[in-house]
C-alpha cells in the first residue's frame, strides 16, 4: 500500500531513507535536455523474495535535442515548496542495507538522471531525520518517522526532533539548508512526493537502525 502523504516536515531538518521497502517506486526522471528512452519505464520498483530484494526495471535517458518529448516544466512557487528538492550526491552504498530483508539499497545513478529523485514510499517505510548544517538536535525521542496504516488511511508518525540554534555541523554534508516549512504544518497537508539523495555512510550501522544513527559518522 502506497503512502499517500510525505513524511512530516521538521524545521531545519532533512530526512532520508536508509533502505527502501519492497513496493517502493522510484520515478525514472531525466535531467533537462534529456528524456526517457522511447520504450523506457516510468519507474523502477523495489521487489524481491524473502532472501533478496532489488530494483526491477532500469531507467534510461536519451538526448531530447532533436525532439523534446518530455516536457520539463518549472514548478510554480507554491509547488516548489512541496517538492523538497535535494541535489544528488556521488553514491556510496550504505553497507548495512543488504542485511535488511525485504528492502532495497539506494539504486545506483543512471546516465543523465535528474538532479532529484522522486520516491513513492509504502506502508512500513522508515525515514530518519537530522538537523541541517548550523543547527543542533534536541531529542525528545526517536528522530524517525514510519508510514503506518490506520483505519484504512496511511499516515506518518511524528518524529521527536527539534533543531535549534547554530552550533554543530550537518550530518548531510554538502547539502544546502532547505527552506524551513511553517511550524505546525498539519501532516495531512504534506505531499507524498518524496525526493531524496544517497546517504553517504562511512561506518557500518545496526540493521535495526534506531536513533543511534545520529552518532554515526558521515564523510
Amino acid at each position: 500500500e502506497l503512502c499517500d502523504d510525505d513524511p512530516p516536515e521538521i524545521p531545519h531538518a532533512t530526512f532520508k531513507a536508509m533502505a527502501y521497502k519492497e513496493g517502493t517506486m522510484l520515478n525514472c526522471e531525466c535531467k533537462r535536455g534529456f528524456r526517457r528512452i522511447k520504450s523506457g519505464s516510468l519507474y523502477m520498483l523495489c521487489t524481491g523474495n524473502s532472501s533478496h530484494s532489488s530494483w526491477d526495471n532500469q531507467c534510461q535517458c536519451t538526448s531530447s535535442a532533436t525532439r523534446n518529448t518530455t516536457k520539463q516544466v518549472t514548478p510554480q512557487p507554491e509547488e516548489q515548496k512541496e517538492r523538497k528538492t535535494t541535489e544528488m550526491q556521488s553514491p556510496m552504498q550504505p553497507v548495512d542495507q543488504a542485511s535488511l530483508p525485504g528492502h532495497c539499497r539506494e539504486p545506483p545513478p543512471w546516465e543523465n538522471e535528474a538532479t532529484e529523485r522522486i520516491y513513492h514510499f509504502v506502508v512500513g517505510q522508515m525515514v530518519y531525520y537530522q538537523c541541517v548544517q548550523g543547527y543542533r538536535a534536541l531529542h525528545r525521542g526517536p528522530a524517525e518517522s514510519v508510514c503506518k496504516m490506520t483505519h484504512g488511511k496511511t499516515r506518518w508518525t511524528q518524529p521527536q526532533l527539534i533543531c535549534t540554534g547554530e552550533m554543530e555541523t550537518s550530518q548531510f554534508p554538502g547539502e544546502e539548508k532547505p527552506q524551513a516549512s511553517p511550524e505546525g504544518r498539519p501532516e495531512s497537508e504534506t505531499s507524498c512526493l518524496v525526493t531524496t539523495t544517497d546517504f553517504q555512510i562511512q561506518t557500518e550501522m545496526a540493521a535495526t537502525m534506531e536513533t543511534s544513527i545520529f552518532t554515526t559518522e558521515y564523510q
Epitope: E1, L2, D4, D5, G23, N27, E29, R36, K38, S39, G40, S41, L42, Y43, L45, T47, D56, N57, T69, T70, K71, Q72, V73, P75, E79, E82, R83, I118, H120, S191, C192, L193
Partner: antibody
Amino acid sequence: QVKLQQSGTVLARPGASVKMSCKASGYRFTNYWMHWVKQRPGQGLEWIGVIYPGNSDTSYNQKFKGKAKLTAVTSASTAYMELSSLTNEDSAVYYCTREGEGSDYWGQGTTVTVSS
Amino acid sequence: QIVLTQSPATMAASPGEKITITCSASSSISSNYLHWYQQKPGFSPKLLIYRTSNLASGVPARFSGSGSGTSYSLTIGTMEAEDVATYYCQQGSSIPYTFGGGTKLELK
C-alpha cells in the same frame, strides 16, 4: 476516498478539437501518474499516454502523438486531454486512470461522438 | 511495442466452474508490471490483480493470477454469475503501455 470525476459527453464536428477534464480528489494529485485510455464502442482498451502532474512529465503512445495533448493544473487537481483534428475514428469513451499499484482508480469515462 | 494476446477471446461457463484466461506477451516482461482488469458492460474497468498475483482491494479470493516471462494467466476458482464481464491483461513495463484484446466471459 479516491475519486476521478470526468467531464460529460461531447458531440463534435469532424476537424474540431475537444478538451476533456479529469478532476481528482481524495489523494495528493501531484504524486501519481495519470493515464488516459481510449475505448471504441464494442472494442478493447487502448493506451493513449500518461502525465505526471508533479512536474508535467508526459509520455505518449506514438499512435496518438499530434492527436492527444495531456496537461495538468495542480492547483485544481485536474488533468486534461485535448484531442485535435477529430474524425469518426475518435468517437469513443475516454478514461483517465491513476497509476498506483496498477491502475487502481478509473474515472467514469467521457464519451466523445464525432458527427457532421 | 509489447503485444499482449489473450485467449480465449470469448468463453461461456456455468456457475461453479473453474475458469482460466491466458495472456501471452510478444516479449518477456517482468511479472511486477503485469496487471488484470475486469470491465462489466456500461462500467469503467476495475483493477482486479496487480503485479501478476496480488489481489486488488475488495476483490474476492476466488480470483488468482500467476505467470512469468511471456506467459500469464488469470484464474477464477469457482465462477459466479457476477463474474460475467470482459477481462483485460495490461503491461506497464515499457512505454507504450499495452492491453490484451480482452476475454469476454459469459454465463452458459
